[in-house]
């Protein structure tokens, strides 16, 4: 058993049929010594008495809010949550496996630049009685500070018969050095509580591996005289690290016909312009990637040819 926060405790349980559970000692937070009784949740049925109470915790019916009383007055509360371990593996019932980039990916994180700011998100089908708490650091043995905000519901989607809820959080490394080579990874830890079930999820990464630039901005077409060719130009996204001479991007320019089956013409360039043939009803799209490190491509920025 360990304390998650004041008066909230997590009991770690091996979860199998007829498991004996854990013996947990509750102590009433009071100077009183005598006449103390204990109840569980809203029940008026007395569980036991004494300043300390030893309880057997083996199922969710044993979790909940234990309250000690004296003469009708509430003295203190202890909320017990359960963390299940089945076959040596902690349960992951609350969050959905996003399966990208690999199985058992519950947290996904991205950074728009090297400033030390990043966003993580996760998915669940649970809509109520759900709380999240996020902590982060650079390294784990001698951790350096990363400050995370509160997790918020960022999207709702319908997937077949189910509703899916996306939560996200923004974090910022306290003393980020954008140009420095990373040697210790960022660690992100999410505590999830659904009703009386506790779970925790972790992710470990280097900022350089989660970089995904915003799409190029100000995408424009300039027809070339007496030609089917156009000059496409764009700019670095505002959110990208500066100076651009050091934090450089490479770009992919694509000409796509109206039909997805039509052949795509692609051009790769380090410049912020390219000359391409603009076919009727086609569109031109440009995306960006860090020039010196193969992290994710940005989403496409697009304009129609006409």
């Amino acid at each position: 058993i360990w304390e998650l926060k004041k008066d909230v405790y997590v009991v770690e349980l091996d979860w199998y049929p007829d498991a004996p559970g854990e013996m947990v000692v509750l102590t009433c937070d009071t100077p009183e010594e005598d006449g103390i009784t204990w109840t569980l949740d809203q029940s008026s049925e007395v569980l036991g008495s004494g300043k300390t109470l030893t309880i057997q915790v083996k199922e969710f019916g044993d979790a909940g809010q234990y309250t000690c009383h004296k003469g009708g007055e509430v003295l203190s509360h202890s909320l017990l949550l359960l963390h299940k371990k089945e076959d040596g593996i902690w349960s992951t019932d609350i969050l959905k496996d996003q399966k990208e980039p690999k199985n058992k990916t519950f947290l996904r994180c991205e950074a728009k630049n090297y400033s030390g700011r990043f966003t993580c998100w996760w998915l669940t089908t649970i809509s109520t009685d759900l709380t999240f708490s996020v902590k982060s650091s650079r390294g784990s043995s001698d951790p350096q500070g990363v400050t995370c905000g509160a997790a918020t519901l960022s999207a709702e989607r319908v997937r077949g018969d189910n509703k899916e809820y996306e939560y996200s959080v923004e974090c910022q490394e306290d003393s980020a050095c954008p140009a420095a080579e990373e040697s210790l990874p960022i660690e992100v830890m999410v505590d999830a509580v659904h009703k009386l079930k506790y779970e925790n999820y972790t992710s470990s990464f280097f900022i350089r591996d989660i970089i995904k630039p915003d799409p190029p901005k100000n995408l424009q077409l300039k027809p070339l005289k007496n030609s089917r060719q156009v000059e496409v130009s764009w700019e670095y996204p505002d959110t990208w690290s500066t100076p651009h001479s050091y934090f450089s991007l490479t770009f992919c320019v694509q000409v796509q016909g109206k039909s997805k089956r039509e052949k795509k013409d692609r051009v790769f360039t380090d410049k912020t312009s390219a000359t391409v043939i603009c076919r009727k009803n086609a569109s031109i799209s440009v995306r960006a990637q860090d020039r010196y490190y193969s992290s994710s491509w940005s989403e496409w920025a697009s304009v129609p040819c006409s």
């Epitope: 559970g21 007395v46 569980l47 083996k58 044993d62």
Partner: nanobody, 114 residues
Framework: EVQLVESGGGLVQPGGSLRLSCAAS????????MYWIRQAPGKGLEWVST???????AYADFVKGRFTISRDNAKNTLYLQMNNLKPEDTALYYC????????RGQGTQVTVSS
């Protein structure tokens, strides 16, 4: 009519063991939390242990891992396994359907003495 009949008490040396039983009838035993309470000579009733309908237990501080409460719903029977008994465990032990002992049996005497 609710009936609770305790048995299994006796005289035992310090460090010894006893297993108390309580046969219940006249009510839906499996639907109730059940309790062991005791009364030492010249003292009031003292709560010992509780077992919930699920089989999960709670114990008084003085028990310190020495006693184990259990139930057999098929036999409508409550048990208290008492190990490493001490002289201060000497008391009349009751099984009860409520914490206050308002619905309890006649008790079984446990005496721990050398």
């Amino acid at each position: 009519e609710v009936q609770l009949v305790e048995s299994g008490g006796g005289l035992v040396q310090p460090g010894g063991s006893l297993r108390l039983s309580c046969a219940a009838s006249g009510f839906a035993f499996s639907n109730y939390w059940m309790y062991w309470i005791r009364q030492a000579p010249g003292k009031g009733l003292e709560w010992v242990s509780t077992i919930k309908t699920s089989g999960s237990a709670a114990y008084a501080d003085f028990v310190k891992g020495r006693f184990t409460i259990s139930r057999d719903n098929a036999k409508n029977t409550l048990y208290l396994q008492m190990n490493n008994l001490k002289p201060e465990d000497t008391a009349l032990y009751y099984c009860s359907r409520d914490y206050a002992g308002t619905v309890r049996g006649q008790g079984t005497q446990v005496t721990v003495s050398s």
